[in-house]
């Protein structure tokens, strides 16, 4: 039985101010060293403690960085991507793709290179049902007091 991995893919603009020790994260990827199969994008491999990214809290390990200060990171050599970050200045705007793994199921397998997301109702319906059950249980409990 193959496990199925599904993702919610969201994009976010993150504005960081370079701190005393810099932006505070590491990257992998690039056209010369693909981190994800069939994807030469740039990914966050490490968030450093107490760095600007860690203190901001939005950037996560595993995030894909799409652009830096409006400059696309597609088809860049790894070194060129590093240079771009290091020369980015004091205020740095990152366009980031988050991928939230939301379900493991028994059918098929979706590879890392395929960012297709699970339909949102598949997440919301169980959450709504749980909320209703909790509310009903609370009302019953209050009636017994």
């Amino acid at each position: 039985m193959n496990g199925r991995v599904d993702y919610l893919v969201t994009e976010e603009e993150i504005n960081l101010t370079r701190g005393p020790s810099g932006l505070g994260f590491n990257i992998v990827g690039g056209t010369d060293q693909q981190y994800v199969s069939n994807d030469s994008g740039i990914y966050v491999s490490r968030i450093k403690e107490n760095g600007a990214a860690a203190l901001d809290g939005r950037l996560q390990e595993g995030d894909k960085i799409l652009s830096v200060n409006g400059q696309d990171l597609k088809n860049l050599l790894h070194q060129d991507a590093v240079d771009l970050f290091r020369n980015a200045g004091y205020a740095v705007s990152l366009r980031v793709q988050h991928r939230l793994q939301v379900q493991n199921g028994p059918i098929g397998h979706r590879g890392e290179g395929d960012p297709s997301g699970i339909p949102i109702f598949m997440v919301l319906v169980p959450v709504f049902a749980l909320t209703m059950v909790a509310a009903w249980a609370f009302m019953r409990y209050r009636q017994q007091l």
Partner: nanobody, 130 residues
């Protein structure tokens, strides 16, 4: 712990060349981010050049603007050695040159090098340009 021993310093005329070496022991060399710093008399220690092995089969390099095009940093993982080839030396390159190392094998840092990033230091080798 990492031990670093520099060699190759000396006196040279302006326009000349020197090659510094830094032999490392005590830890897997390929997992170390390596750099050269220098300290001129009466001045603070400053960054010169950096080399890292990003764990995916490639090296990364970074230089301070004042040495770009003149200095080349490289490493030989098989020999556990870091090098700094210095060409077209100028009197302002006179300083004690230090090798430094930091364990950082999870990709490449997006931040310019900082002294405080480096955990291990050599004793230094004197370079004098007249």
């Amino acid at each position: 712990h990492v031990q670093l021993v520099e060699s190759g310093g000396g006196s040279v005329q302006a326009g000349g060349s020197l090659r510094l070496s830094c032999a490392a022991s005590g830890r897997t060399f390929s997992s170390l981010r390596m750099a050269w710093f220098r300290q001129a008399p009466g001045k603070e220690r400053e960054f010169v050049a950096e080399n890292w092995w990003n764990g995916q089969g490639g090296q990364g390099v970074w230089y301070v603007d004042s040495v770009k095009g003149r200095f080349t940093i490289s490493r030989d993982n098989a020999k556990n050695t870091l090098y700094l080839q210095m060409n077209n030396l100028k009197p302002e390159d006179t300083a004690v040159y230090y090798c430094a190392a930091h364990r950082d094998d999870s990709g490449s840092t997006v931040d310019p090098p900082n002294q405080s990033d480096y955990d291990y230091w050599g004793q230094g080798t004197q370079v004098t340009v007249s």
